[in-house]
């Protein structure tokens, strides 16, 4: 059975998505910048109709590994997701690794397409740059995540954010629209129109098949 | 187990300052990040200032720009230095704590702090 909550806003994305949300670990972000990045994924979240039918979410941070907080198919209230959500640790990593994080997206997450009628979107949250040796498959695994129809949306944050990857993801599809902001302090701003952008990416629920109508019997 | 014991509040005319101080007991101080909120008469506690363990900082709009909090690790105490003071900013001012080893949240929320002072009174007359 769906655990459903009511709507905490007025916009309300009810929609087939399964949206990822990625988040950069690294010490380019303070520990206070950090914070609102996780209030900003908290903020996005009560505006999606989550639950196994409609939007199901996953929540990942990443530095030189990844670490999954929510899965996709985590069966609990929206509520108790939200909550997972601001539970996320600040690791303040040298190094956030967006290559191992597209790589977790690819083969942990979209590993195997179990709602092929729902758009798949990455939410790729990035404040830094990684080595370049740790980004040889790059574009690889950016390609990868286009075969298997998912969406990345790069969100630039500040000055140190690897806008030449940003420009490499654009590329890739032109759904891949990347949102470069110059803090922390503009994601509120923009968070409704990525959450509508977002939206407007997938598809509504088919109307519910009705049943074919019995032969009437005349006597 | 964390202790807190703020200090420092009076009561003010307008527009004077005040520094607020809250001293902290127990280890791992440094790795805590802290926060100060307030509760005016009638009204809710609300968020103030967060400042983290890498000493980074962020304000609610009320006091940016006024306040500025502060830490000294060596000393276990976290300051609230509070400047042009307004009849509003009247309100008992609590010192809050997150053990970070094994709990986060969204810092705005008093849910996310494991451990809280008793609070100290700060009246600002018009």
């Known amino acids: 059975e769906d655990i459903s909550e009511p709507p905490l806003h007025d916009f309300y994305c009810s929609r087939l998505l399964d949206l990822v949300f990625l988040l950069d670990g690294s010490s380019r972000l303070s520990e206070a910048e950090f914070e609102v990045l996780k209030a900003f994924v908290v903020d996005m979240m009560e505006r999606l109709r989550i639950s196994q039918k409609w939007v199901r979410v996953a929540v990942v941070e990443y530095h030189d590994g990844s670490h999954a907080y929510i899965g996709l198919k985590d069966r609990k209230r929206p509520s108790e997701l939200r909550r997972i959500a601001s539970q996320v640790k600040y690791a303040g990593s040298q190094v956030a690794s967006t290559s191992e994080v597209l790589k977790y997206t690819l083969f942990q997450i979209f590993s195997k397409i179990d709602r092929p009628e729902a758009s798949r979107i990455a939410l790729l949250l990035m404040a830094s740059q990684e080595p370049q040796r740790m980004s040889r498959n790059f574009v690889r695994y950016v390609q990868g995540l286009k075969k298997k129809k998912v969406i990345v949306i790069p969100v630039g944050i500040g000055p140190h954010a690897n806008l030449k990857q940003i420009r490499l993801i654009e590329k890739q599809a032109p759904e891949n629209k990347a949102f470069v902001l110059s803090s922390v302090d503009e994601l509120e701003q923009q968070r409704d129109e990525i959450v509508s952008y977002l939206c407007d990416l997938a598809p509504e629920a088919p109307p519910p098949t009705l049943p074919p109508h019995m032969a009437q019997v005349t006597v | 187990q964390v202790q807190l014991q703020e200090s420092g509040g009076g009561l003010v005319q307008a527009g004077a300052s005040l520094r607020l101080s809250c001293a902290a007991s127990?280890?791992?101080?440094?790795?805590?990040?802290m926060a100060w909120f307030r509760q005016a008469p009638g009204k809710e506690r609300e968020f103030v200032v967060f400042i983290g363990s890498d000493h980074s900082t962020l304000y609610s709009t009320s006091v940016r720009g006024r306040f500025t909090i502060s830490r000294d690790n060596a000393k276990n105490t976290v300051y609230l230095q509070m400047m042009n003071l307004k009849p509003e900013d009247t309100a008992v001012y609590y010192c809050?704590?997150?053990?970070?080893?094994?709990?986060?949240?969204?810092?705005?929320?008093?849910?996310?702090?494991?451990?809280w002072g008793q609070g100290t009174q700060v009246t600002v007359s018009s």
């Open positions: 809050a704590a997150r053990n970070s080893a094994w709990s986060s949240g969204i810092y705005y929320r008093e849910t996310s702090y494991d451990y």
């Open positions: 127990g280890r791992s101080f440094s790795s805590y990040p």
